[in-house]
Interface confidence: medium
């Protein structure tokens, strides 16, 4: 009779993570008598996967009943496959021996490859806010996929970005891989409502890529523009001066009025109006009693936005142009100076 051969008909098997792998193996003869064992890998470091004779292998089931006398099918199923299960599996026939069974013949091996989906991409932006015209970096990470081939794209709103660097790690062979990409994005004043999107395409996703997003509202700071104007006189000897704070984001803002450099009032932006682009406007007013001043008054609207150094705008109120009997505001002028105060004023909130 011809000598027993161990046949593993599949050179390779491809299985998705979480599924069951079937590893086929048949013997061509019932002789010699003895058990079969399955191993992952060859040589002294091989890993026992299944032993027909003894042991507990909860993830492994046999395809046919190995207790039947004439059985020559030694195929197994391995459940709940993970990328760590990848490798070459050998079906090995042992000859009954004393005291130990002796390895008789091995199959040619079946390479198990595992397809694993990438995790949902996680996009993270810079730790600190940045102002328009600045370039900021966003990172995107996805893990646990196999095989290694993967495509990553970046978008700002609907537009694909080109300035990015991508690494797939490890660079060598591995059971699963990670991708890490860093994109550079230039901020504009209109980016409060913008989104940065990282899109990952992989063979396991069947054409339905995974996306991770970051809102630029968490990254951008749009500094305010200030305008100080004098309103028509409300009452005799009183002048109403307003400070328009426009197009700022985020909302965190504190305004201080100064009369000739002395703090008059401090308030925090509360009832703001929102612009279409997501930025905010706010207005504060100051009622100045002209009769209380002998000389001209320098009014300053000083704004501290989102913890940044204060910006200010001043307005000169000419007291000489306000005789008590007149309600004219013609001589009042807006200097238009836009000073930066790099010291912080500590005020009691009004």
């Amino acid at each position: 009779e011809e000598e027993l051969q161990v046949i593993q008909p599949d050179k390779s098997v491809l299985v998705a993570a979480g599924e069951t792998a079937t590893l086929r193996c048949t013997a061509t003869s019932l002789i010699p008598v003895g058990p079969i064992q399955w191993f992952r890998g060859a040589g002294p470091g091989r890993e026992l996967i299944y032993n027909q004779k003894e042991g507990h292998f909860p993830r492994v089931t046999t395809v046919s009943d190995l207790t039947k006398r004439n059985n020559m099918d030694f195929s197994i199923r391995i459940g709940n496959i993970t990328p760590a299960d990848a490798g070459t599996y050998y079906c090995v026939k042992f000859r009954k021996g004393s005291p130990d069974d002796v390895e008789f013949k091995s199959g040619a091996g079946t390479e198990l490859s595992v397809r694993a989906k990438p995790s949902a991409p996680v996009v993270s932006g810079p730790a600190a806010r940045a102002t328009p015209q600045h370039t900021v970096s966003f990172t995107c990470e996805s893990h646990g996929f196999s095989p290694r081939d993967i495509t990553l794209k970046w978008f700002k709103n609907g537009n694909e970005l080109s300035d990015f660097q991508t690494n797939v790690d490890p660079v060598g062979e591995s059971v699963s891989y990670s991708i890490h990409s860093t994109a550079k994005v230039v901020l504009t004043r209109e980016d409060v409502h913008s989104q940065v999107i990282c899109e990952v395409a992989h063979v396991t996703l069947q054409g339905d890529p995974l996306r991770g997003t970051a809102n630029l509202s968490e990254t951008i700071r749009v500094p305010p523009t200030l305008e100080v104007t004098q309103q028509p006189v409300r009452a005799e000897n009183q002048v109403n001066v307003t400070c328009q704070v426009r197009k700022f984001y985020p909302q965190r803002l504190q305004l201080t009025w100064l009369e000739n450099g002395n703090v008059s009032r401090t308030e925090t932006a509360s009832t703001v109006t929102e612009n279409k682009d997501g930025t905010y406007n706010w207005m504060s007013w100051l009622l100045v009693n002209v009769s209380a001043h002998r000389d001209d008054v320098k009014l300053t609207c000083q704004v501290e936005h989102d913890g940044q150094p204060a910006v200010s705008k001043s307005h000169d109120l000419k007291v000489s142009a306000h005789p008590k009997e007149q309600g004219s505001n013609t001589a009042a002028e807006n200097t238009g100076s836009n000073e930066r105060h790099h010291h912080h004023h500590h005020h009691h909130h009004h």
Partner: antibody, heavy 119, light 107 residues
Framework: QVQLVQSGAEVKKPGASVKVSCKAS????????MHWVRQVPGQGLEWMGW????????KYSQKFQGRVTITRDTSATTAYMELSSLRSEDTAVYYC????????????WGKGTTVTVSS | DIQVTQSPSSLSASVGDRVTITCRAS??????LNWYQQKPGKAPKLLIH???SLQNGVPSRFSGSGSGTDFSLTINSLQPEDFATYYC?????????FGGGTKVEIK
């Protein structure tokens, strides 16, 4: 036996380019990657990039991106590294080294090519 | 990019001493770490790959260990020919990077 034979020393002026060759023998050229590593006098080792000799896939260090070009000629079993816009700080010994595809270690090294950049 | 920090930068030892050099990666690199020896005017020579696998032809007095972020190279009984500079290199992620080197000098 496995060996990598590099081209001879070069002296270049700032702004010029240099092309260093690395002839491989004693193994199947297309079965490995070829790395390029440089060493500035008195300093450590700095990886510049690799080429996978089989499929031609190239990876450069960001530091040299735009200035370095790595190529290979499989019929001549030779890898090349060209560095352009040379400056004095590029004066160094440039090594080619055979790379494993799994752990990306460099198991065989050329003797090195000294490139001197001086006006 | 992954940074690899080697320590010490230099050490003095005598023949027969046991010497240990450490290498720390800025993030986990599994066992993708290799060790090289370089003598003045010569190309580096691979000693250990995959953190602990001794390269063919390298004396058994050299050994490597570690995984994740912390690794070490040990020379069990220092020989005269072992006085050289040693470099670790991570091969987990590009750009591949080397440690700054450890110069082993005669005491």
């Amino acid at each position: 036996q496995v060996q990598l034979v590099q081209s001879g020393a070069e002296v270049k002026k700032p702004g010029a380019s240099v092309k260093v060759s690395c002839k491989a023998s004693g193994y199947t050229f297309t079965s490995n990657a070829m790395h390029w590593v440089r060493q500035v006098p008195g300093q450590g080792l700095e990886w510049m990039g690799w080429i996978k000799a089989g499929n031609g896939e190239i990876k450069y260090s960001q530091k040299f991106q735009g200035r370095v070009t790595i190529t290979r000629d499989t019929s001549a079993t030779t890898a090349y590294m060209e560095l352009s816009s040379l400056r004095s700080e590029d004066t160094a010994v440039y090594y080619c080294a055979r790379g494993d595809y799994y752990y990306y270690y460099m198991d065989v090294w050329g003797k090195g090519t000294t490139v001197t950049v001086s006006s | 990019d992954i940074q690899v920090t080697q320590s010490p930068s230099s050490l003095s030892a005598s023949v027969g001493d046991r010497v240990t050099i450490t290498c720390r990666a800025s993030q986990s690199i599994s066992d993708f770490l290799n060790w090289y020896q370089q003598k003045p005017g010569k190309a580096p020579k691979l000693l250990i790959h995959a953190a602990s696998s001794l390269q063919n032809g390298v004396p058994s007095r050299f050994s490597g260990s570690g995984s994740g972020t912390d690794f070490s190279l040990t020379i069990n009984s220092l020989q005269p020919e072992d006085f050289a500079t040693y470099y670790c290199q991570q091969s987990y992620s590009t750009p591949l990077s080397f440690g700054g080197g450890t110069k082993v000098e005669i005491k």
